[in-house]
């Protein structure tokens, strides 16, 4: 229903703690390089300005639209173009392409420090002086520095660090309380951040089609009881949220994420046995915990697939008939019938039907044609299959640290030109996928381990647009989404690439690596390591090793000498002249 | 919505000749065979001759083989059948159908071949 003032309904649904919270988030998100105090002084000016719109709906500038609203207060902040430069032009463009432009303005990588930490006295006296402002110092940090993270979901994160606070600030021993659970929280956090990027990459780049195609998939294979009915209905619901939150309304997506675990909580009976817990719990939990609940158990007599697909004399009448909505059923039955596949899977599939009936049905006799589909199929899932295997294997064999490396020396073969830092973040984080899923029951792997990977690669991905430099990385970027983690596994050793020269400074190491934390030892050594391949695209696995544990036992060496100045000037010399000779 | 309605049908006497056609909409036409299948009075469904969507490949069953042609026109989107050489046995009502389908959605036309 329309209602006259957008922002007192928005105001009055969500009440004043979440309405700020995410007028705070889309603020941070848009201008990522303004302090919090300088946020925080628009969105009380703008909360102040949605109680007078409750108070009085037909008060003045009331019933303009969000973005208006929003767009105003951006164009209004003091030396905008100094600071932001090209991006004060979109304050010269009126709604909606102000809009897109503030958009388009959005940064994956802003040039700001890491989010640190402080040590844990530190964090608790200014937590318990004003939690309201700690926290809100946590969603302009976190926010800022990922401009696409799923709003709603942020809040929630918020509301478990506020709770882990409240708990570990009241231990005698809070660093040790607070330490393993807020590690927790910032990995999830970081792993929703990239999904969420995904889901955004996917509506931008090929519209609401193709993100409501990734919804049946994942949706079926949660609920495997509901009827196509009921998961087109969700799907396209969570497409709406999706499109509003990667489009920055905030406010409307939080509203109607609300609303749409309402609904599913009023549903059960028709949607999935497994919602009751999430039903219980208050609004973020419960909207969280149904983004993430187990899979429904899969009903007993489930017909073969291709009985309708496939055998069914009706198959290309019934594609002319309604195209999408046959591909839609085709989709969901498979995946209803398939917890045990990627998303990204299921959606090749899609495809390879798709195409199969496009050239199929075009033919004389059809039937003899596409009779073969679901064989054809099998190529494509052994692929993955492979995939895993192998990887969850050498992951097994070398531990967390080691599969990282080996990721590493692979794509900096595969995409030499690429930044080092670039190499290693993405190295470190496709490296995770081997605890984050390779210790979960084999069903569970598969789906963990490619949708993983692929929100990954779309990082890279949209790394690499900002300063394409890998023609590699361009073609497997340029094509869909579910082709480029197939395209970036096939890629080999990038032959056009003419090697670095061996710069010494390069691997020239100082006593300050000795008091670094675990983290950044690690990151200093896989940096030297992916200069090594850069320098020698097609040094073996065995002369890397040769040469990473000597620098390995180096470090060990003069970290542990009682003048490690002297130890790292004389011994770091050796050491290059020893890598140059076993790379030679 | 997809239609597909036939025309053409009607007596006509042993050994003479009728062309039947079928007007598509609501689809891309050129993207899919199409065929005819025929119902004789009291009989089941018989499917008589398809055609590629580009109008190159045909097939025909062989009660009809060297008598009947199909043929298509993807910028009328209409399908066609010339049926020479009629016999009594080819009364029926003659459908027209996407891809392999045996089973019509349209009313078809009747055909009777009698002297």
């Known amino acids: 229903e329309a209602h006259k003032s957008e922002i007192a309904h928005r105001y009055n649904d969500l009440g004043e703690q979440h309405f700020k919270g995410l007028v705070l988030i889309a603020f941070s998100q848009y201008l990522q390089k303004c302090s919090y105090d300088e946020h925080a002084k628009l969105v009380q000016e703008v909360t102040d300005f949605a109680k007078t719109c409750v108070a009085d709906e037909s008060a003045a500038n009331c019933d303009k639209s969000l973005h208006t609203l929003f767009g105003d207060k951006l164009c209004a902040i003091p030396n905008l173009r100094e600071n932001y430069g090209e991006l004060a032009d979109c304050c010269t463009k009126q709604e909606p392409e102000r809009n897109e432009c503030f958009l388009q303005h959005k940064d994956d990588n802003p040039s700001l420090p890491p989010f640190e930490r402080p040590e844990a006295e530190a964090m608790c006296t200014s937590f318990k002086e004003n939690p309201t402002t700690f926290m809100g110092h946590y969603l302009h940090e976190v926010a800022r520095r990922h401009p696409y993270f799923y709003a709603p979901e942020l809040l929630y994160y918020a509301e478990q660090y506020n709770e882990i606070l409240t708990q570990c600030c009241a231990e005698a021993d809070k660093e040790s309380c607070l330490t393993p659970k807020l590690d927790g929280v910032k990995e999830k956090a970081l792993v929703s951040s990239v999904r969420q990027r995904m889901k955004c990459s996917s509506m931008q780049k090929f519209g609401e089609r193709a993100f409501k195609a990734w919804a049946v998939a994942r949706l079926s294979q949660t609920f495997p009881n509901a009827d196509f009915a009921e998961i087109t209905k969700l799907a396209t619901d969570l497409t709406k949220v999706n499109k509003e939150c990667c489009h920055g309304d905030l406010l409307e997506c939080a509203d109607d994420r609300a609303e749409l675990a309402k609904y599913m909580c009023e549903n059960q009976a028709t949607i999935s046995s497994k919602l009751q817990t999430c039903c219980d719990k208050p609004l973020l939990k419960k909207a969280h915990c149904l983004s993430e609940v187990e899979h429904d158990t899969m009903p007993a007599d489930l017909p073969a697939i291709a009985a309708d697909f496939v055998e069914d004399q009706e198959v290309c009448k019934n594609y002319a008939e309604a195209k999408d909505v046959f591909l839609g059923t085709f989709l969901y039955e498979y995946s209803r019938r398939h917890p045990d596949y990627s998303v990204s899977l299921l959606l090749r599939l899609a495809k390879k039907y798709e195409a199969t009936l496009e050239k199929c049905c075009a033919e004389a006799n059809p039937p003899a044609c596409y009779g073969t589909v679901l064989a054809e199929f099998q190529p494509l899932v052994e692929e993955p299959k492979n995939l895993v295997k192998t990887n969850c294997d050498l992951y097994e064999k070398l531990g967390e640290y080691g599969f990282q490396n080996a990721i590493l020396v692979r794509y900096t073969q595969k995409a030499p030109q690429v930044s080092t830092p670039t190499l290693v973040e993405a190295a470190r984080n496709l490296g995770r996928v081997g605890t984050k899923c390779c210790t979960l029951p084999e069903d569970q792997r598969l789906p963990c381990v490619e949708d993983y990977l692929s929100a990954i690669l779309n990082r890279v991905c949209l790394l690499h647009e900002k300063t394409p430099v890998s023609e590699h990385v361009t073609k497997c970027c340029s094509g869909s989404l579910v082709e480029r983690r197939p395209c970036f596994s096939a890629l080999t050793v990038d032959e056009t690439y003419v090697p670095k020269e061996f710069k010494a400074e390069t691997f020239t190491f100082h006593s300050d690596i000795c008091t670094l934390p675990e983290k950044e030892k690690q990151i200093k050594k896989q940096t030297a390591l992916a200069e090594l391949v850069k320098h020698k695209p097609k040094a073996t696995a065995e002369q890397l090793k040769t040469v990473m544990d000597d620098f390995a036992q180096f470090l060990d060496t003069c970290c542990k000498a009682a003048d490690k100045d002297t130890c790292f000037s004389t011994e770091g010399p050796n050491l290059v002249t020893r890598c140059k000779d076993a790379l030679a | 919505e997809v239609q597909l309605v036939e025309s053409g049908g009607g007596l006509v006497q042993p050994g003479n000749s009728l062309r039947l056609s079928c007007a598509a909409s609501?689809?891309?036409?050129?993207?899919?065979?199409m065929s005819w299948v025929r119902q004789a009075p009291g009989k089941g469904l018989e499917w008589v001759s398809s055609?590629?969507?580009?109008?190159?490949?045909?097939l025909y069953a062989d009660s009809v083989k060297g008598r009947f042609t199909i043929s298509r026109d993807n910028a009328k989107t209409t399908l066609y059948l010339q049926m020479n050489s009629l016999r009594p046995e080819d009364t029926a009502v003659y459908y027209c159908?996407?891809?392999?389908?045996?089973?019509?959605s349209s009313q078809g036309t009747l055909v009777t071949v009698s002297s």
């Open positions: 159908t996407i891809g392999g389908s045996l089973s019509p």
């Open positions: 609501g689809f891309t036409f050129s993207s899919f065979g």
């Open positions: 055609i590629s969507g580009s109008g190159s490949d045909t």
